[in-house]
């Protein structure tokens, strides 16, 4: 039997710079029944609160609600490993929220097969951003990858389209159905999920309507 | 306890590419980006780019876009910075260094000198 | 890119006494946010760099309460109030509101 071991906070998530999760690893717990907790100060701040909510996001993690995120505040975070033999802590994390942005997918993804002049085919894709974003006002600048790929195949092809929400593919085999999916990144965080697939079928006559 | 170490010194000719690796411990190597940052003789601070380890998604200073390419092995937790087209201003000590979820640098290696010389 | 201009560029300061160090950048650094990324890292001798302080005027884990910052918009201040042996190196600024990052040229300090 032993003190615990120490934490370490691996991962905090943002879905929309209004709320976050942090979520740590316990770290051993020297065969003795372990309480965990998480505490925090802000910048120029001397205060130390405790985790408002262990609860929401799951085990060994602190959801910080709208009332308790702020983006113009760093948070200091630790977390704390009690059993009867003693306690440990983890490095101090500090956390921007403009930095743990993860959002939702994009939304809409709409195919649809089009023909230039010359006849030739191309898959025009579009798509809006997540729900919660509010792009318009420059508050979030996001980037967007799709990908695609005949149903069969095992590799994507991927394109990045930078801020733009529509891309045209060409040279697509006539005849297959192709799957495409599409995410987005803001400034300064992480790409969410990729969206859930989307299936188009190219037509192997080419008389179509522009 | 968070540690950065970095491969050793490299002698180079003018032309050729170098890679600095730097091994990542004491913390969950795909949850942090990783920088890359250099300082000629003497002289100040360059930032050559950032990777996330989670995604290899990469920036990079638009002066070294290019030259510069920045991978990891999460296996290893090793990051690594190849600059290629080396040329004698290259000569500078390159670190690596992780920041928390914010935008500065709160944990470097100990830095690799790269010298580039015919 | 932001260009970071340090002064002066060397420092002599007696124990006990203090000192200041100017940073002025070519750009506004406030962020979309509404926050000033501005920091101030110290490289002691032999040494890879450490950060003092983090958005302007906080002091990071660790660093004694004697190493200051202020300043807004373009003008930046470091202040140390009593200079102690073990201040001495090179201290750099640096901003990373603006991609790509960018640092001052150094202001090396040294005890008289």
């Known amino acids: 039997q032993s003190p615990p071991g120490k934490p370490e906070i691996h991962k905090c998530r943002s879905p929309d710079k209004e709320t976050f999760t942090c979520w740590w690893n316990p770290g051993t717990d020297g065969g003795l029944p372990t309480n965990y907790s998480l505490t925090y100060s802000k910048e120029g701040e001397k205060t130390t609160y405790e985790c408002p909510d262990y609860k929401t996001s799951g085990p060994n993690s602190c959801f910080f609600s709208k009332q308790y995120t702020s983006i113009w505040k760093i948070y200091i975070i630790t977390v704390n490993a009690t059993n009867q033999m003693g306690s440990s802590s983890s490095d101090p994390l500090y956390v921007d929220v403009t930095y743990i942005v993860e959002p939702e997918p994009p939304r809409n993804l709409t195919l649809e097969v089009k023909q230039l002049k010359d006849k030739k085919t191309y898959l025009w894709v579009k798509w809006s951003p997540p729900t919660i974003t509010d792009v318009k006002t420059g508050w979030f600048t996001m980037e967007y990858e799709i990908r695609l790929k005949p149903e069969e195949a095992e590799e994507w092809e991927i394109h990045f389209t930078g801020h733009q929400t529509q891309f045209k593919v060409f040279d697509l085999y006539p005849g297959q159905k192709y799957l495409v999916q599409t995410r987005c990144k803001p400034d300064h965080g992480y790409w969410s999920r990729w969206s859930q697939e989307s299936s188009v079928e190219m037509p192997n006559d080419f008389t179509l309507k522009d | 306890e968070v540690q950065l170490v970095q491969s050793g010194a490299e002698v180079k000719k003018p032309g050729s590419s170098v890679k600095v690796s730097c091994k990542a411990s004491?913390?969950?190597?795909?949850?942090?980006?990783m920088h890359w940052v250099r300082q000629a003789p003497g002289q100040g601070l360059e930032w050559i780019g950032v990777?996330?380890?989670?995604?290899?998604?990469?920036n990079y200073n638009q002066k070294f876009k290019g030259r510069a390419t920045l991978t990891v092995d999460e296996s290893s937790s090793t990051a690594y910075m190849e600059l290629s087209s080396l040329r004698s201003e290259d000569t500078a000590v390159y670190y690596c260094?992780?920041?928390?979820?914010?935008?500065?640098?709160?944990?470097w290696g100990q830095g690799t000198l790269v010298t580039v010389s015919s | 890119d932001v260009v970071m201009t340090q002064t002066p560029l060397s420092l002599s300061v007696t124990p006990g006494q203090p000192a200041s160090i100017s940073c002025r950048s070519s750009?506004?650094?406030?962020?979309?946010?509404?926050?000033?990324?501005l920091h101030w890292y110290l490289q002691k001798p032999g040494q890879s760099p450490q950060l003092l302080i983090y958005?302007?005027?906080n002091r990071f884990s660790g660093v004694p309460d004697r190493f200051s910052g202020s300043g807004s918009g373009t003008d930046f201040t470091l202040k140390i109030s009593r200079v102690e042996a073990e201040d001495v190196g090179v201290y750099f600024c640096?901003?990373?509101?603006?991609?790509?990052?960018?640092f001052g040229g150094g202001t090396k300090v040294e005890i008289k």
């Open positions: 958005k302007v005027s």
């Open positions: 260094a992780r920041g928390d979820y914010s935008n500065w640098f709160t944990y």
């Open positions: 640096s901003q990373s509101t603006h991609v790509p990052w960018t």
């Open positions: 004491g913390y969950t190597f795909t949850s942090f980006w």
């Open positions: 990777i996330d380890p989670s995604d290899t998604y990469t």
């Open positions: 750009q506004r650094l406030v962020h979309s946010n509404g926050n000033t990324y």
